[in-house]
Amino acid sequence: EQAPGTAPCSRGSSWSAALDKCMDCASCRARPHSDFCLGCAAAPPAPFRL
């Protein structure tokens, strides 16, 4: 986890201001509206899980 303004989150993760921590971009498949998903590299749309 990173503090904002310091080194970026590790590959495959992005900073969430709401949760105050780096979060996994992979979780954007299930929760695409999470704030940190804006910072994740665009990927082809995946099947959306229930």
Epitope: A18, L19, D24, A26, S27, R29, R31, P44, R49
Partner: antibody, heavy 119, light 111 residues
């Protein structure tokens, strides 16, 4: 420090009811999805139920084996969630764990509580 | 439901050697970008502990002796070099869809 503290469990007769509780601390509870996972020698680790966050309309999902019998709920104001179990049968016997997930993996776990369904 | 098949059910590995545990899903649990497969370690009397998320991403605080690989339907957990403290049961779990399901577990013994 993240903690999930469980209560409830014990011995219940077949056809009886039991309510399990889990109180969370040390993380942003309201943003996380919460699940119950049970474990038995016969079935191993088995996901039971999930309740999502307010932003996901508190959607609930259940394993087929407990649909209509178990009800999951949460109280974000007190960082706690519950599993109401009705019409219990011997096959519901096991260790029940509460767990949190942002979306995919079970990150934090409670200590587990034993449920025995027997006459 | 997606069935997770773990092999072997148990294994004994000499201290300092490599332990390899396999998990096969009954259908693909991967996109072109990520695999929705996770690994846990469980010791007697304790809840499972997350080791690897998304097939290969090491959870914070987990020693680099643990590594995960695979995509699609076939995944592997490697532990090298194994230490005495690694005696435990290891489980895989997918999050591709509901219901989430776990493998049957692999009991690791250190010789």
């Amino acid at each position: 420090q993240v903690q999930l503290q469980q209560s409830g469990g014990g011995l219940v007769q077949p056809g009886g009811s039991m309510k399990l509780s889990c109180i969370a601390s040390g993380f942003t509870f309201s943003s996380y999805w919460m699940s119950w996972v049970r474990q038995s020698p016969e079935k191993g680790l088995e996901w039971v139920a999930e309740i999502r966050s307010k932003s996901d309309n508190y959607a609930t999902h259940y394993a087929e084996s407990v649909k209509g019998k178990f009800t999951i709920s949460r109280d974000d104001s007190k960082s706690r969630f519950f599993l109401q179990m009705n019409n219990l049968r011997a096959e519901d016997t096991g260790i029940y764990y509460c767990s949190s997930t942002y979306a995919d993996y079970f990150h934090y776990w409670g200590q587990g509580t034993d449920l025995t369904v027997s006459s | 439901d997606i069935v997770m098949t773990q092999t072997p059910a148990s294994l004994a590995v000499s201290l300092g050697q490599r332990a390899t545990i396999s998990c096969r899903a009954s259908q693909s649990v991967s996109t072109s970008t990520y695999s929705y497969m996770h690994w846990y370690q469980q010791k007697p009397g304790q809840p499972p502990k997350l080791l690897i998320k998304y097939a290969s991403s090491l959870e914070s605080g987990v020693p680099a002796r643990f590594s995960g690989s695979g995509s699609g339907t076939d995944f592997t957990l490697n532990i090298h070099p194994v230490e005495e403290d690694d005696t435990a049961t290891y489980y895989c779990q997918h999050s591709w869809e509901i219901p989430y399901t776990f493998g049957g577990g692999t009991k690791l013994e250190i010789k």
